[in-house]
């Protein structure tokens, strides 16, 4: 699977889930999250041969055409897979108020 | 919706659906696929600016952190939402079969 | 099966106009956008022209803008370029393609009309 455990060992070339570390305030100008201050987001990215971790039949028979036409330029891209929340703090007024953002990690990533 | 409809009448330049025809035979080498001879696979492309048809959470962070820090080069890919099947004919011998592909046409696209 | 078949091309004179047409065939025409694109002598093929399903959107390549116009008639699943001001660099064999080729350079499915620009 081309995940982090995967990806972050071996630093592969072609689609891999890669690490990208981002600070609330200074990246996105988000203010309001109080904790955490940042968080690995991560991101996906590599070129995606034929049959590598191909999502469905489209990006498999995709693939092969590229291969086989490769001045096409209509090749399958590195995407997310699994994704997990990120519990943040932030404050309404003086109340405190923790929640759950859904798919916010990117643990692996697919060519779609 | 980054659809078809919409898409092949509007020729966007960011994420949208883009016509593919795939000639069986002469595009993948598939001589044992009897009919149809071809299919519009079509495919997805196009730069995904900052919630341009966002799939989760994470894709509207980074093309956010993307919009903020532009030589990041870590941005959402256009991929595809929605496909439909298609239905081939083949034979095993002199036996025709008949299947239907999952998976095998775009109808629409996301940035995720 | 999807087919393209080009006609109208020509010698003609700089200065001069032609008008190319392209029937096609196997596929719903109304439903994708089309393309122009041209091969000169010794060279790769050149994207000229895209309109859009409907007719309502069209883009030119910079060489040919304010001189070629791409039009269509959905009822008749024909595709035209008309081709004013023709410069003899606009000398090339002149296919259609289905679909958008700005996007995708897929082979070239009909056999072409020759262009040629000369005096």
């Known amino acids: 699977a081309l995940d982090t455990n995967y990806c972050f060992r071996n630093l592969e070339e072609n689609c891999c889930v890669r690490p990208l570390y981002i600070d609330f305030r200074q990246d996105l100008g988000w203010k309001w999250v109080h904790e955490p201050k940042g968080y690995y987001a991560n991101f996906c990215s590599g070129p995606c041969p034929y049959l590598r971790s191909a999502d469905t039949t489209h990006s498999t028979v995709l693939g092969l055409y590229n291969t086989l036409n490769p001045e096409a330029s209509a090749s399958p891209c590195c995407v997310p897979q699994d994704l997990e929340p990120l519990t943040i703090l932030y404050y309404v007024g003086r109340t405190p108020k923790v929640e759950q953002l859904s798919n916010m990690v990117v643990k692996s990533c697919k060519c779609s | 919706a980054l659809d078809t409809n919409y898409c092949f009448r509007n020729l966007e330049e960011n994420c949208c659906v883009r016509p593919l025809y795939i000639d069986f035979r002469q595009d993948l080498g598939w001589k044992w696929v009897h009919e149809p001879k071809g299919y519009y696979a079509n495919f997805c492309s196009g730069p995904c600016p900052y919630l341009r048809s966002a799939d989760t959470t994470h894709s509207t962070v980074l093309g956010l952190y993307n919009t903020l820090n532009p030589e990041a080069s870590a941005s959402p890919c256009c991929v595809p939402q929605d496909l439909e099947p298609l239905t081939i004919l083949y034979y095993v011998g002199r036996t025709p079969k008949v299947e239907q592909l999952s998976n095998m046409v775009v109808k629409s696209c996301k940035c995720s | 099966q999807l087919q393209l078949v080009e006609s109208g091309g020509g010698l003609v004179q700089p200065g001069g106009s032609l008008t190319l047409s392209c029937a096609a065939s196997g596929f719903t025409f109304s439903l994708y956008p089309m393309s122009w694109v041209r091969q000169a002598p010794g060279k790769g093929l050149e994207w000229v022209s895209v309109i859009g399903s409907d007719g309502g959107t069209k883009h030119y390549s910079d060489s040919v803008k304010g001189r070629f116009a791409i039009s269509r008639d959905n009822a008749k699943n024909t595709l035209y370029l008309q081709m004013n001001s023709l410069k003899p660099e606009d000398t090339a064999v002149y296919y259609c393609?289905?679909?958008?080729?700005?996007?995708?350079?897929?082979?070239?499915r009909g056999q072409g009309t020759q262009v040629t620009v000369s005096s």
């Open positions: 393609a289905e679909g958008d080729s700005r996007y995708v350079r897929g082979r070239t």
